[in-house]
Interface confidence: medium
């Protein structure tokens, strides 16, 4: 807490400008009007305040807005955002995607901090669902964002938002998350033709049930081994040798290299040796 001291004569700040960087912390506290700061927040980023000086500016805004900052101030926080605690952010009502982008920009290149996680949570809850524009923005800044959500949170993602998802956004998703996302993706891409559909649905297939894999095997999709290895074991086990051969197409030879790993290992053990021999790969059940 900065103690209250009178502003020295002639030091009262008429505006937010570079001269303030040479003010000591107590001078900033005493000589900068909080309302002036709030209306000229956009200037703060153009001035190289030290981290300690930013503490004082935050303190002034906290006094002016004890119930939480208005969005007009939040949008221009810039580096001051790094000073906010999750508790501060929970008081905010952020509705504009532009405000969200401006604050994510400040944290760009760094891991998602508790502040950012709280901001995103507040924003998404305020919107009621994770719409396409929001998802587009969040995955652009944090490719792993989608996979950081619980299955319950993912259930609020409308199928239309799935169009914003890129394959790399799903890299760290576990089967429980893909179980939620796959049906949404299936719905989102349902009007696409065979080969285009497969390209889009491929990265979601870790949530696909057996019947959908069987259907894909009839469409000459040539699934690569990396995708096959991410399929649910319980969905792969009921597939016949013929169905797996059709599903993988020319990639079927890759089964040999993966024969000791799940789901291939478990699938092999379920097959008749005669059927496995038809592949000519030397797989032993």
């Amino acid at each position: 807490e900065v103690e209250k001291t009178a502003c020295p004569s002639g030091k009262k700040a008429p505006e937010i400008d570079e001269s303030l960087i040479f003010y000591k912390k107590w001078e900033l506290e005493a000589c900068v009007d909080a309302a002036l700061l709030a209306t000229q927040m956009d200037r703060v980023n153009a001035i190289p305040f030290t981290y300690e000086q930013l503490d004082v500016l935050k303190h002034k805004l906290d006094e002016l807005y004890p119930q939480g900052y208005p969005e007009s101030v939040i949008q221009h926080l810039g580096y001051l955002f790094l000073k906010m605690s999750p508790e501060d952010i929970r008081k905010w009502n952020v509705t504009s995607l532009e405000t969200l982008k401006a604050l994510l920009e400040v944290n760009k290149g760094h891991e998602m901090s508790p502040q950012v996680a709280t901001l995103i949570d507040r924003f998404v809850k305020g919107r009621g669902q994770l719409d396409k524009d929001t998802l587009d923005t969040l995955t652009a800044f944090y490719p792993g964002y989608l996979c950081s959500l619980s299955p319950e949170e993912l259930s609020s993602v409308p199928p239309s938002s799935i169009w914003a998802v890129r394959p790399q956004d799903l890299d760290t998703c576990d089967p429980r998350q893909l179980d939620v996302l796959y049906p949404k993706a299936r719905l989102a891409f349902q009007n696409m033709n065979g080969s285009e559909y497969f390209v889009k649905i491929q990265s979601f297939l870790g949530g696909a049930p057996t019947e959908d894999l069987k259907a894909l095997s009839q469409q000459n999709v040539s699934m690569d081994l990396a995708t096959f290895m991410k399929l649910r074991t319980d969905a792969v086990l009921p597939l016949t040798v013929a169905e797996v051969q059709k599903l993988l197409g020319p990639h079927v030879e890759g089964l040999k290299a993966e024969e000791r790993h799940r789901p291939v290992r478990d699938w092999i053990l379920r097959q008749r040796q005669d059927d496995l021999d038809t592949l000519g790969l030397g797989l032993q059940g």
């Epitope: 912390k25 980023n45 190289p48 030290t50 981290y51 300690e52 790094l82 290149g109």
Partner: antibody, heavy 120, light 107 residues
């Protein structure tokens, strides 16, 4: 990989001026303040000043006001420091250094340094 | 200006030692202190920021402590590659200022 590549060593005569460059790569140049620091023999590091590439605004250590001028060229992601009216006191190694507000206002990445020798 | 005083210009050490380098600010700087390592012919490298936070990739044998006016950089298990100059810096207020440096040498 972040990199701050500074221009090569300079040998200049007293009274002349010199302009040292610092080219940034591997990160968004306009997102980070750029500082300049002097390291002279027998002395510690001295902070010269800082410039905000996004706005071109700069602030100087009073000791270097009038001696150093900081500028940036956003299009080439390059920061410059011009030193004028050079004397032997200006002979030193000069560093550009990125200031990342995420890490307080510490200088998280430094150029390799430019050696300036002022001699007649 | 805030003066950062590193009272020991040189410190003799051996591999495996616990080394503590001190830095004193002429006025309260809170935790706005960073520590840098500089090896001969190289530029300084950030080790510690905000007095006690280890920068990305810095080995955990380096720890920073202190607040207000007194700060310490500790190397818990000295390695030969740690022989270098160490500088403290305050960024509480302008102008930013550095300590004179402490050089670690082998006994």
């Amino acid at each position: 990989e972040f990199q701050l590549q500074q221009s090569g060593p300079e040998l200049v005569k007293p009274g002349a001026s010199v302009k040292i460059s610092c080219k940034a790569s591997g990160y968004s140049f306009t997102d980070y303040n750029m500082n300049w620091v002097k390291l002279s023999n027998g002395k510690s590091l001295e902070w010269i000043g800082v410039i905000i590439p996004n706005y071109g605004t700069s602030s100087y250590n009073q000791k270097f006001k009038g001696k150093a001028t900081l500028t940036v060229d956003q299009s080439s992601s390059t920061a410059y420091m011009q030193l004028n009216s050079l004397t032997s006191e200006d002979s030193a190694v000069y560093y550009c250094a990125r200031w990342d507000n995420y890490y307080g206002s510490s200088l998280d990445y430094w150029g390799q340094g430019t050696t300036l020798t002022v001699s007649s | 200006d805030i003066v950062m005083t590193q009272s020991q210009k040189f410190m003799s050490t051996t591999v495996g030692d616990r080394v503590s380098i001190t830095c004193k600010a002429s006025q309260n700087v809170g935790t706005a202190v960073a520590w840098y390592q500089q090896k001969p012919g190289q530029s300084p490298k950030l080790l510690i920021y905000s007095a006690s936070n280890r920068y990305t990739g810095v080995p955990d044998r380096f720890t920073g402590s202190g607040s207000g006016t007194d700060f310490i950089l500790t190397i818990s298990n000295m390695q030969s590659e740690d022989l270098a100059d160490y500088f403290c810096q305050q960024y509480s207020s302008y102008p930013l200022t550095f300590g004179a440096g402490t050089k670690l040498e082998l006994k």
